[in-house]
C-alpha cells in the first residue's frame, strides 16, 4: 500500500515568524527509523528546508542550525518552523520516509500554505 501523509492546507505564522503544523502518516509497516523532511515549493522549484531522522519512540532531532524543531508521537510529527518572513510565504511539503527495516516507503503530503506577515514597525513616539 502507498503511504498516505496528511498535513493542514493552511497555517498562519505568528507575529514572531513562527509557524507550526502536524504531519501525520499512515504507516504500511512497522518502521523503527523514520526520516521527516520539510520541503518548500515555489513555482516549480523544490528546496529542502530541514530534515530529521529519528528512531520510533525517540525525540525528533534537527541539526543545531536548523530553522525547524519538532516532536514525534506515534505516526504524528509536530513541526515548527521559525524565523519566517513575508518573503517565505509559500507551500511547505511534509515528506515522510520509512528508512528501516525494509521495505522502504515514502509519502508526500499535499503541502501546507504558510502565510507570513511581517509585523509593522512600531511608530516613533515623541
Amino acid at each position: 500500500k502507498a503511504m498516505h501523509v496528511a498535513q493542514p492546507a493552511v497555517v498562519l505564522a505568528n507575529s514572531r515568524g513562527t509557524a507550526s503544523f502536524v504531519c501525520e502518516y499512515a504507516s504500511p509497516g512497522k518502521a523503527t527509523e523514520v526520516r521527516v523532511t520539510v520541503l518548500r515549493q515555489a513555482d516549480s522549484q523544490v528546496t529542502e528546508v530541514c530534515a530529521a531522522t529519528y528512531m520510533m519512540g525517540n525525540e525528533l532531532t534537527f541539526l543545531d542550525d536548523s530553522i525547524c524543531t519538532g516532536t514525534s508521537s506515534g505516526n504524528q510529527v509536530n513541526l515548527t518552523i521559525q524565523g519566517l518572513r513575508a518573503m517565505d510565504t509559500g507551500l511547505y511539503i511534509c515528506k515522510v520516509e520509512l528508512m528501516y527495516p525494509p521495505p522502504y516507503y515514502m509519502g508526500i503530503g499535499n503541502g501546507t500554505q504558510i502565510y507570513v506577515i511581517d509585523p509593522e514597525p512600531c511608530p516613533d513616539s515623541d
Epitope: A2, E33, V46, I93, E97, P103, M106
Partner: antibody, heavy 120, light 108 residues
Framework: QVQLVESGGGVVQPGRSLRLSCAAS????????MHWVRQAPGKGLEWVAV????????YYADSVKGRFTISRDNSKNTLYLQMYSLRAEDTAVYYC?????????????WGQGTLVTVSS | EIVLTQSPGTLSLSPGDRATLSCRAS???????LAWYQQKPGQAPRLLIY???SRATGIPDRFSGSGSGTDFTLTISRLEPEDFAVYYC?????????SGPGTKVDIK
Amino acid sequence: QVQLVESGGGVVQPGRSLRLSCAASGFTFSSYGMHWVRQAPGKGLEWVAVIWYDGNNKYYADSVKGRFTISRDNSKNTLYLQMYSLRAEDTAVYYCARGGILAAGIFDYWGQGTLVTVSS
Amino acid sequence: EIVLTQSPGTLSLSPGDRATLSCRASQSGSSSYLAWYQQKPGQAPRLLIYGASSRATGIPDRFSGSGSGTDFTLTISRLEPEDFAVYYCQQYGTSPFTSGPGTKVDIK
C-alpha cells in the same frame, strides 16, 4: 550543472569481482540518495541498489542481494558499486542516478553509463 | 514487489500525431508515485514526468501525464521527430523501485 560520470566497467569472467565508481559534481552530494540502475543489452531498466543520504541505509534488488555492495564517500563526492560473484546475467550498462529531492526514488539525473560484460 | 505493465509494446506513428502510452501497476502501492522516462538509442534515460503528472525541469508541455492508483497514462500531444524513443514508467513509492518493460514509439 549536475554531472555524474561512471567508470570501472569492462570484461570480466564469471565468478570474478569488479568495482564501479561514479564521480558526482554540481550539487551537494551528501544531501541526496544515490542509485545504481542497469540495463541489459536490448532490455529495459532494472534498479540495482540505493544508498541513502548518510550512507547508513542501503537497499538492494533481490537479484544482486548478497553479491553487490553499494557505498559512498561524501568527502570525495563518489558513489561505488562493488560487484562479487559476477554472472553472465549481470552483463549490462550500469548507470548511476541521483535520487530526486522531492522523492529519493525518482532518478532525476543520470550518468552516461559504463558497460560491464561478464563472459568466459 | 509492484509489477508495472506497459502497453502497447510498440507504437508506430507519424510526426504530428498524438501518442498515448499506458502503464498499469499490479497494486495501488504506487499511488501517484509514478515517473516516466524517455530513452534514445545509446543515451541514458531522461526524467520526463514525476508524481504521475508533474513535468520535470525543461520538459516541453506537449508531454503530459495523468492517472492514479493503478492506471497511468503518458500523452505526447504532437509528436516531434526527437520524440521517437523508448518510454518507461517507474514507481518510487516503495522498494524495490520497479520499472515497466517500456513502450517504443517509432516512425510509421
